[in-house]
Structures are given as structure tokens and as C-alpha cells.
């Protein structure tokens, strides 16, 4: 099929980047500028994305491939390719309707993007609190109460960062 | 006028440092591709690199490592700081703005040169 | 890297003449070449683009032309203005996210 398709189409021999100019007694013609074709025998060229806005330019539009945009700083990538901008919260937030909001008591966010999420209930693995979980951090599990021998020396969670959390027991 | 002029040019010694400024008029340099070229005496020419308006900066891959480019926003003009010179670094430097948001050179300065010798 | 083949290296013409000169790359480049038009002691100054888009300002008696690997300048009829140096020079992405700008040898346009 394709070396039918190649005897009887003058357009499957125009290779990426070119488009098939049927104004030009269909030869093999540039995609012009802001405009690319990232696959040969095309009949037309595609119209390159422009990063406007919050969006900036991380590669620039060829005549075979897209532009790729990112977010300015403050703001991430979401969705495919990069299709929308959200805004960045501080660790210990996330992104509501009316803004960035600090993460409800027993929860954290330790990243700049995504929703706060419950500290890790250290009771469902037999074990104990070792450090107790901010807005920011996780709790950390230590070992069982069983696993501390008589007279062994417990250890002495440091001051919380912000408020002094406890794992839901 | 939409231009540009490079300065910071000179002789200096191999394995020494310099910084070439590129400042900019009649545009902003921050929405364009920025782009350093340099071309050896009788020799062709050679790109350097770009910081695109995104800020992203690329290099070709005899430039990476020693070479960094950067921009002042606030004083609209690019710089190249070398690093680790060697004699056959010794070329004029130009700047240029890219084209249609690309980065071909479209409009150029009128070069700077720099010599490694000792 | 992608390598540019340029030739010829020189050619000697007359004022009326047609003159070519061809870029061949390594590798298939889309349409992703400019030309460049370089006078002695001066700066270079862009020709096209995009293999065939004429920039701002450039006399159409210039034009581009190609895609893929081989790619040609063309000066309808050579002016005496236009004896002077010209350079190809390819963009190339590569996966790595490296960028290749490639420039040609170069083609000295010498009066016959």
C-alpha cells in the first residue's frame, strides 16, 4: 500500500517540516515561520503554540516539533503538555477556590502544589510517634512501645516547627 | 534605533576570566531569544548560545561548561561570562536578537573582540 | 552533532549573474536553515529563514530554497553590493533536549 500510495501521491514525499503546496503544483514547500509539521506528507502546517501570559517558553517552535511552554515562576504545569497553570502555594498550604489555605490540623503538604494529606497513623503499624508531623511534615514512625526495653532511653521529639501536631491514634 | 552594543572586549590571559556585556536599545531585550556568536580571525562562525524569553538558556554542546549567559532585565542588556580561556577562544563575540521568536540571529551588534594570549 | 556541508567554497561571478549555493545536512533538519550574508569587518547579516522566508529589508532577487538534508541559496542576479561571504546554519533539537546550531564552511562570492 504505501508504495502505491508513494507512485500516486506527490505529497507523501514531503518530509517533515514541509507541507504539500497544492499552489505549487504540489511540491514540497517550508512550513513558514510560527507554523510546523511534525510528520511528512502533510497538506497543511500546524500552527505553533504561543507561551503567553503565565506561560513561558521553554522550547521554541521548529519547523518539525511544537513549542513547549511552562509556568513563570509562582505558578506550575498541569495537565498534558503542560495546558494549564496553577498558581504555587508555601509548604503547609494547598490551593482552594478562594486561594492558598494553610493544611487543617492533622495534615501537611511538604510541597508546593497538590492538597494536604493526613499524617501517617504510626498505631496502624504497631509503632509509635518518633517526631510529631507539622503543617509542613509527615509524623515519623518510630519503633512500638513493646520494642522500648526497661530502661532504655526514649527518644525526645524536637520542637514542631509550627504547631505541635500528634498522629490520630 | 533598535540596536545593540557589545563591550568588555580585550586581551587576556589563558585560563583567565572575562564577562562581555550586550546592551540593548529601541526593544526589550527579555522577550526575545538572545543569542552570543563568535567567529575566529579568518575563520567562520560559531554559535555560542541563547537565553530564550522564557528564561531558559542553551548552549551548543563546545560552550557548555565554561561559558554562561545571563541577562539584566532592569539595564535591558545580556552578558557572557567566560571562563577558562584558552587561546582559540580568541574570536570577535557578537550578540544578537532572534528572529520571529526563533533563535536565528536576525539583527547583530557590531562584535567585540577577544583575544587569549599571553 | 549535525554537520553542514557547504559548497562551494568560493565562486567567481560576474554583476548579472545567476548564482547557487547549496547547504547539504548530516541529518534531516525540517526546514530549519537561515543564510547569512557577511561583508569583511562586518557583522553578518540574516538572508532567510525557514529555509525560503525572505527577512525584513533583503533584496528578492535572494531566495531559499530546500528541505530535509539539501537546501539552496540563490541570487537571481548578482549585484555588485552582494560580493561578500555567505554562511548556511541549521537548528536542530536533539531528544537529549541539546540544541544544535550548525553553520556551513562558508561561500566566498569573489568578482570574476
Known amino acids: 500500500f504505501e508504495r502505491t500510495r508513494s507512485l500516486q501521491d506527490p505529497c507523501s514525499n514531503c518530509p517533515a517540516g514541509t507541507f504539500c503546496d497544492n499552489n505549487r503544483n504540489q511540491i514540497c514547500s517550508p512550513c513558514p515561520p510560527n507554523s510546523f509539521s511534525s510528520a511528512g506528507g502533510q497538506r497543511t502546517c500546524d500552527i505553533c503554540r504561543q507561551c503567553k501570559g503565565v506561560f513561558r517558553t521553554r522550547k521554541e517552535c521548529s519547523s518539525t516539533s511544537n513549542a513547549e511552554c511552562d509556568c513563570t515562576p509562582g505558578f506550575h504545569c498541569l495537565g498534558a503538555g503542560c495546558s494549564m497553570c496553577e498558581q504555587d502555594c508555601k509548604q503547609g498550604q494547598e490551593l482552594t477556590k478562594k486561594g492558598c489555605k494553610d493544611c487543617c490540623f492533622g495534615t501537611f503538604n511538604d510541597q508546593k502544589r497538590g492538597i494536604c494529606r493526613p499524617w501517617t497513623n504510626c498505631s496502624l503499624d504497631g509503632k509509635s510517634v518518633l517526631v510529631n508531623g507539622t503543617k509542613e511534615r509527615d509524623v515519623v514512625c518510630g519503633p512500638s512501645p513493646a520494642d522500648l526495653s526497661p530502661g532504655a532511653s526514649s527518644v525526645t521529639p524536637p520542637a514542631p516547627a509550627r504547631e505541635p501536631g500528634h498522629s490520630p491514634q | 534605533e533598535v540596536q545593540l552594543v557589545e563591550s568588555g572586549g580585550g586581551l587576556v590571559q589563558p585560563g583567565g576570566s572575562l564577562r562581555l556585556s550586550c546592551a540593548a536599545s529601541g526593544f526589550t531585550i527579555s522577550s526575545h531569544h538572545m543569542i552570543w556568536v563568535r567567529q575566529a580571525p579568518g575563520k567562520g562562525l560559531q554559535y555560542i548560545g541563547f537565553i530564550n524569553d522564557g528564561d531558559y538558556t542553551y548552549y551548543t554542546n563546545s560552550a557548555k561548561g565554561r561559558f554562561t549567559i545571563s541577562r539584566d532585565n532592569s539595564k535591558n542588556t545580556l552578558y557572557l561570562q567566560m571562563n577558562s580561556l584558552r587561546a582559540e577562544d580568541t574570536a570577535v563575540y557578537y550578540c544578537?536578537?532572534?528572529?520571529?521568536?526563533?533563535?536565528?540571529?536576525?539583527?547583530w551588534g557590531q562584535g567585540t573582540l577577544v583575544t587569549v594570549s599571553s | 552533532d549535525v554537520v553542514m556541508t557547504q559548497s562551494p567554497s568560493s565562486v567567481s561571478a560576474s554583476v548579472g549573474d545567476r548564482v547557487t549555493i547549496t547547504c547539504q545536512a548530516s541529518q534531516s533538519i525540517g526546514a530549519d536553515l537561515a543564510w547569512y550574508q557577511q561583508k569583511p569587518g562586518k557583522a553578518p547579516k540574516l538572508l532567510i529563514y525557514?529555509?525560503?522566508t525572505l527577512a525584513s529589508g533583503v533584496p528578492s532577487r535572494f531566495s531559499g530554497s530546500g528541505s530535509g538534508t539539501d537546501f539552496t541559496l540563490t541570487i537571481s542576479s548578482l549585484q555588485p553590493e552582494d560580493f561578500a561571504t555567505y554562511y548556511c546554519q541549521a537548528i536542530y533539537y536533539g531528544t537529549d533536549d541539546v540544541i544544535y546550531h550548525t553553520f556551513g564552511g562558508g561561500t566566498k562570492v569573489e568578482i570574476k
Open positions: 544578537a536578537r532572534g528572529v520571529d521568536g526563533t533563535s536565528y540571529p536576525g539583527l
Open positions: 525557514r529555509a525560503s
